[in-house]
Amino acid sequence: LVPHLGDREKRDSVCPQGKYIHPQNNSICCTKCHKGTYLYNDCPGPGQDTDCRECESGSFTASENHLRHCLSCSKCRKEMGQVEISSCTVDRDTVCGCRKNQYRHYWSENLFQCFNCSLCLNGTVHLSCQEKQNTVCTCHAGFFLRENECVSCSNCKKSLECTKLCLPQIENVKGTEDSGTT
């Protein structure tokens, strides 16, 4: 099965790369606008210039295009702990990220929140914190991992998964008690 092309792709595919088909006259191929600009008026005829205008402040286009309007610059989400890495220019959107010693947790494809990297207290760093992943910790004996923190086995309830991890510790405690009662 041949996938269906959208109207815009169909129109563009008739013209060579870097050009698009005139919306009112499909025998004319107009040159696309450079990044940082948008289409103000289509070219009046073959070999004639397309009227492209520079994006206004607060907007951008990141690739060659024939958009009637520039795209609005993204704003970094303070409520998600985001900070601005680089500001928006006419040809590049705002780049948002996290502070030092933080990582991004993606709640969805286009929404991330910044969280502090785990320090692995009562454990050791197995994998260092990365841009999009928290530190991976390995806990010391007598501790188990809960939400990426090393928690004392004394907080382990029977019904929880930690019983497997804390069982040797519990047995050791019992063994010590038993040996002292003879």
Epitope: R77, E79, M80, F115, E147, N148
Partner: nanobody, 119 residues
Framework: EVQLLESGGGMVQPGGSLRLSCAAP????????MVWVRQAPGKGLEWVSH????????YYADSVKGRFTISRDNSKNTLYLQMNSLRAEDTAVYYC????????????WGQGTLVTVSS
């Protein structure tokens, strides 16, 4: 113990509207960013919309943009979600929660309210 109480769910026809509420008694509501998440049958949690503590910064998932509106009334400790032009794919249990601070799991959230969109 903090309890978030959602209400306003129900059965509605495609194209219809509902307004969900989330009451947060005994909660420092005005210092919390709040979020609506939903879980469709047999699916994972989806972040639907959130609102900053100031009430100004808002976010909507692409799937609900232009149809849903999030708002809050700090004097009533209540969060709202106005849902218009409902579709079958909006059928889910809707939960309100505070935006997590320490790590990517929800500290406080409610029991949920079921929204069913069906003709």
């Amino acid at each position: 113990e903090v309890q978030l109480l959602e209400s306003g769910g129900g059965m509605v026809q495609p194209g219809g509207s509902l307004r969900l509420s989330c009451a947060a008694p005994g909660f420092t509501f005005e210092h919390e960013g709040m979020v609506w998440v939903r879980q469709a049958p047999g699916k994972g949690l989806e972040w639907v919309s959130h609102i900053g503590e100031d009430g100004q910064s808002t976010y909507y998932a692409d799937s609900v943009k232009g149809r849903f509106t999030i708002s809050r009334d700090n004097s009533k400790n209540t969060l709202y979600l106005q849902m218009n032009s409902l579709r079958a794919e909006d059928t889910a249990v809707y939960y309100c929660a505070s935006i997590p601070k320490a790590g990517p799991s929800f500290d406080y959230w409610g029991q949920g309210t079921l929204v069913t969109v069906s003709s």
